[in-house]
Amino acid sequence: FVRTKIDTTENLLNTEVHSSPAQRWSMQVPPEVSAEAGDAAVLPCTFTHPHRHYDGPLTAIWRAGEPYAGPQVFRCAAARGSELCQTALSLHGRFRLLGNPRRNDLSLRVERLALADDRRYFCRVEFAGDVHDRYESRHGVRLHVTAAPRIVNISVLPSPAHAFRALCTAEGEPPPALAWSGPALGNSLAAVRSPREGHGHLVTAELPALTHDGRYTCTAANSLGRSEASVYLFRFHGASGAST
């Protein structure tokens, strides 16, 4: 028989889980795991199942984004009787199985984290052989990636009536606070835009009117650090252009 179930118990167990006759399918994952960009994270996932001493072929799968339909980021398969789960897919070569699926452990290591990895992940196990059965975590584990600020773009743009404006875009998690400093400015938070839709870690600050020539510095700061970048405005007086 083929059966797909969803789990109701998703608490992180610290002990290794072993199957017993009365056990049902369940998966244990923590609600959230946090790690810094550039570092590694572990996504824990253990499971119980009703098929005592199952020794047949199995496949371990991790998806991102949503259960059942989300794209696979990792997949491995273990042959009958084998403790080795042979990796068949590892997105960008950054996902590595830590756990032993034969011991009901699908825990995954994610290397070289980026802010784009900040999403929900779902573990799944499939049995094939004498027993055909499968089970997938429904709620999954949220990977929360934190990052010190990084200024991704700083520029000076023309605006109407021969004026100029400056834009500074930074990324980070928590989203950084941006401040401009420059000639006759002091320190100014200057029209900070909220994180853009679909770009949750990006923040933009605009200086709408640059009134003086000179160096304008954007500083991005959050609890993990700060970053700054500068642009220079030199207008050719009597002409309509500017050098930046």
Epitope: L12, V33, Q86, T87, G93, R109
Partner: antibody, heavy 121, light 110 residues
């Protein structure tokens, strides 16, 4: 039975080059990462380099102290791994071990018997 | 780089418990997984994996060997020392590249 056999060690002058080879058998070579670890005489162990398998795009990693002077490579058809060393220095004198590691763990579950590299004039 | 520190030598009587410690310069544990591994090296031989990820016994290793610890402090225990356990023991971390080893602890019979 897992077997790992290194060769290619010997006496080389400072500034010289050497290519170490590691032949393996008894396991499915394609499923594993391979590494070189060295041990200077009467000293501790130092990881040198790692090469991952095809699924992991044959990615290579090196100890900073050796980067630029060593290159790790593998030949899946021959179940072999190599370490090309150049600009050798006296402090590179060591026994070089070829080791195997699982794709999920950067620990070394099988080791060869090692090959001695001596850098001296 | 993560620096691992072990005491250089230890002398224990046959049949007694031997405890070898390893300290890391920063935590090597993520989400309950500790990336510390233990090796045994006898004179003139290559190292042999004993324990992986702090507490898992490697294949073919006698049950008198065990590992424990979390964060920065780890211990390899031999419950009842045998003559064949005379060797140097190394811990290694794989929390962050480059993978590093401690200097080793030489275990002798008292």
């Amino acid at each position: 039975e897992v077997q790992i056999v290194e060769s290619g060690g010997g006496l080389v002058q400072p500034g010289g080059s050497l290519r170490l080879s590691c032949a393996t058998s008894g396991f499915n070579f394609n499923d594993y990462f391979m590494n070189w670890v060295r041990q200077a005489p009467e000293k501790g162990l130092e990881w040198v380099a790692q090469i991952r398998n095809k699924i992991y795009t044959y990615a290579t990693f090196y100890a900073e102290s050796l980067e630029g002077r060593v290159t790790i490579s593998r030949d899946d058809s021959e179940s072999s791994v190599y370490l090309q060393m150049s600009s050798l220095r006296a402090e590179d004198t060591a026994v070089y071990y070829c080791t195997r590691s699982l794709t999920g763990g950067d620990y070394f579950d099988y080791w060869g018997q090692g090959t001695l590299v001596t850098v001296s004039s | 780089d993560i620096v691992l520190t072990q005491s250089p030598a230890l002398a224990v009587s046959l049949g007694e418990r031997a405890t070898i410690s390893c300290r890391a310069s920063q935590s090597v544990t993520i989400s309950g997984y500790s990336f510390i591994h233990w090796y045994q090296q006898k004179p003139g031989q290559q190292p042999r994996l004993l324990i992986y990820r702090a507490s898992n016994l490697a294949s073919g290793i006698p049950a008198r060997f065990s590992g424990s610890g979390s964060g920065t402090d780890f211990t390899l225990t031999i419950s009842s020392l045998q003559a064949e356990d005379v060797a140097t023991y190394f811990c290694q971390q794989s929390r962050k590249s480059p993978w590093t080893f401690a200097g080793g602890t030489k275990l002798e019979i008292k």
